[in-house]
């Protein structure tokens, strides 16, 4: 009889995670008698995967019944493959003995595991930023194999180019992770904007995975403040309005000061949303002119989203209101409408973007 050969016909086999892998092995002779064993790797540290003779291998099934007459097919099927199963598998023939003696090995079959990347998770900055500032978004996906992967960033459907991507580890591994950081310049129209991280991989059959983040979590749009006086009413009361516009998020506290003393404090709640996602709020203050001998300095103080307060002041000229009605010409608006939050006294320089 010819000398026994152990034949592993496939050099490599690729299997999707969760599926079964069939590793083929045939012997060319029934001689010598002795069992087959399957190992992963070579040398003293090799891992026993299946032994025909003894052991418990719950995930491994011989393809052919080992008790079958004339059996020379020693192929095995490994169920529920995970990336940890990747490696080179050797079918090894032993000669019967006490103990059995290793006789001949097959050339080996490399098992590679195609594992899908996890759903990309996009995380934004820890603190909000204002328009014209650049914020970073990070996208992470794990557990994929093989290593080749494509990641793209989009903002409102437009592909971004300012990002940096790393796939780890750099060397051979059973599975890989990707981490990408994109830099996005905010605009005041970004409350409704969305960034998308798109991951394409061979296991996804052309249907990429997407992770999203809303810029509403990252942006702060500071309010515009405008204080105006309505016509004096017949009862010598002046209606002064503080219009707070185009702000986001909604968290806002408004305080009215009369000559520096707190008159009223209000919290914004349940405001209707503008088309662009921002909010507007109007607050009124009635000032009884006849109760004042001197001009009244009214200040609308707005604290938005935990930022330092923004003030807008307005002077109600008592002398200009003997008893006439319907005029606001004597009112003097001493506030500013600058977006850098200078108050009219120029005491604070709050450049919080």
């Amino acid at each position: 009889e010819e000398e026994l050969q152990v034949i592993q016909p496939e050099k490599s086999v690729s299997v999707a995670a969760g599926e079964s892998a069939t590793l083929n092995c045939t012997a060319t002779s029934l001689i010598p008698v002795g069992p087959i064993q399957w190992f992963r790797g070579v040398g003293p540290g090799r891992e026993l995967i299946y032994s025909q003779k003894e052991g418990h291998f719950p995930r491994v099934t011989p393809v052919s019944d080992p008790t079958k007459r004339n059996n020379m097919d020693f192929s095995i099927r490994i169920s529920n493959i995970t990336p940890a199963d990747a490696g080179t598998y050797y079918c090894v023939k032993f000669r019967k003995g006490s103990p059995d003696v290793e006789l001949k090995s097959g050339a080996g079959t490399e098992l590679s595991v195609r594992a899908k990347p996890s759903a990309p998770v996009v995380s934004g900055p820890a603190v909000r930023a204002t328009a014209e500032h650049t914020v970073s978004f990070t996208c992470e996906s794990h557990g994929f194999s093989p290593r080749d992967i494509t990641l793209k960033w989009f903002k409102n459907g437009n592909e971004l180019s300012d990002f940096q991507t790393n796939v780890d580890p750099a060397g051979k591994s059973v599975s890989y992770s990707i981490r990408s950081t994109a830099r996005v310049v905010l605009t005041r129209r970004d409350v409704h904007s969305q960034v998308i991280c798109e991951v394409a991989h061979v296991t996804l059959q052309g249907d990429p995975l997407r992770g999203t983040a809303n810029l509403s979590e990252a942006i702060r749009v500071p309010p515009f403040l405008e204080v105006t006086q309505q016509s004096m009413r017949a009862d010598n009361q002046v209606n002064v309005t503080c219009q707070v516009t185009k702000f986001y998020p909604q968290r806002l506290q408004l305080t009215w000061l009369e000559n520096g003393n707190v008159s009223r404090t209000e919290m914004a709640s349940a405001l209707p949303e503008n088309k662009d996602g921002t909010y507007n709020w109007t607050s009124w203050l009635l000032v009884n002119v006849s109760a004042h001998r001197d001009d009244v300095k009214l200040t609308c103080q707005v604290e938005h989203d935990g930022q330092p307060a923004v003030n807008k002041s307005f002077s109600v000229k008592v002398s200009a209101h003997p008893k006439e009605q319907g005029s606001n010409t004597a009112a003097e608006n001493t506030g500013t409408n600058e977006r850098d939050y200078k108050d009219d006294d120029d005491k604070h320089h709050h450049h919080h973007h």
């Epitope: 008698v33 069992p35 032994s51």
Partner: antibody, heavy 119, light 110 residues
Framework: QVQLVQSGAEVKKPGASVKVSCKAS????????INWVRQAPGQGLEWIAM????????HYNQIFKDRATLTTDTSTSTAYMELRSLRSDDTAVYYC????????????WGRGTLVTVSS | DIVLTQSPDSLAVSLGERATINCRAS??????????IFWYQQKPGQPPKLLIY???NRDSGVPDRFSGSGSGTDFTLTISSLQAEDVAVYYC????????FGQGTKLEIK
């Protein structure tokens, strides 16, 4: 290493039944055939039957087909051979033997169980 | 059924001499490229021991003075130089179909 440990000697009356056990160790019980062979005093070897413990497939020598039954208990890796309607010429040493190469041969043997049939 | 006939029934050979035991099958035991013949040695009070499988292959641990030959229907077990511990009964067995044994050959020292 492979070991086959058989039950102890039995004395039976004609017409009775005997059930001999063979406990296997040192290998995966379900991966190899178990054969049963007997040897009457001063006589040669006589093959009785064989069983595949993985699925209980059996092959019998026609001479014993109606009187012998092979079974296995995979939870204890034990094979059994029951012989019914015993006669005095069934007095023999009964061996179990494991077929290591699926060649329908007998690679490893138990020590044997002496069954004596006498009135 | 295949019937195996061994010859001689008994044999006496001097120590160091060659011993030859024959086994003839009533029909060919060759199948799938193999001769399905096995040889066993049984010493008094012991179970048989496999010596040769598939006509010509020594089992593990069997001294190389034992050899098997033959094809088709005629087979031979040869002990090239008889040792005292070789005194035993030798059986051939076929398994082209289901196993059957030859009647045995008793080997003694002359």
């Amino acid at each position: 290493q492979v070991q086959l440990v058989q039950s102890g000697a039995e004395v039976k009356k004609p017409g009775a039944s005997v059930k001999v056990s063979c406990k296997a160790s040192g290998y995966t019980f379900t991966n190899y055939w178990i054969n049963w062979v007997r040897q009457a005093p001063g006589q040669g070897l006589e093959w009785i039957a064989m069983i595949d413990p993985s699925d209980s497939e059996t092959h019998y020598n026609q001479i014993f087909k109606d009187r012998a039954t092979l079974t296995t208990d995979t939870s204890t890796s034990t094979a059994y051979m029951e012989l019914r309607s015993l006669r005095s010429d069934d007095t023999a040493v009964y061996y179990c033997a494991m077929d290591y190469g699926s060649l329908y041969a007998m690679d490893y043997w138990g020590r044997g169980t002496l069954v004596t049939v006498s009135s | 059924d295949i019937v195996l006939t061994q010859s001689p029934d008994s044999l006496a050979v001097s120590l160091g001499e060659r011993a030859t035991i024959n086994c003839r099958a009533s029909q060919s035991v060759r199948s799938s490229g193999y001769n399905w013949i096995f040889w066993y040695q049984q010493k008094p009070g012991q179970p048989p021991k496999l010596l040769i499988y598939l006509a010509s292959n020594r089992d593990s641990g069997v001294p190389d003075r034992f050899s098997g030959s033959g094809s088709g229907t005629d087979f031979t077990l040869t002990i090239s130089s008889l040792q005292a511990e070789d005194v035993a009964v030798y059986y051939c067995q076929e398994s082209r179909e289901l196993p059957t044994f030859g009647q045995g050959t008793k080997l003694e020292i002359k």
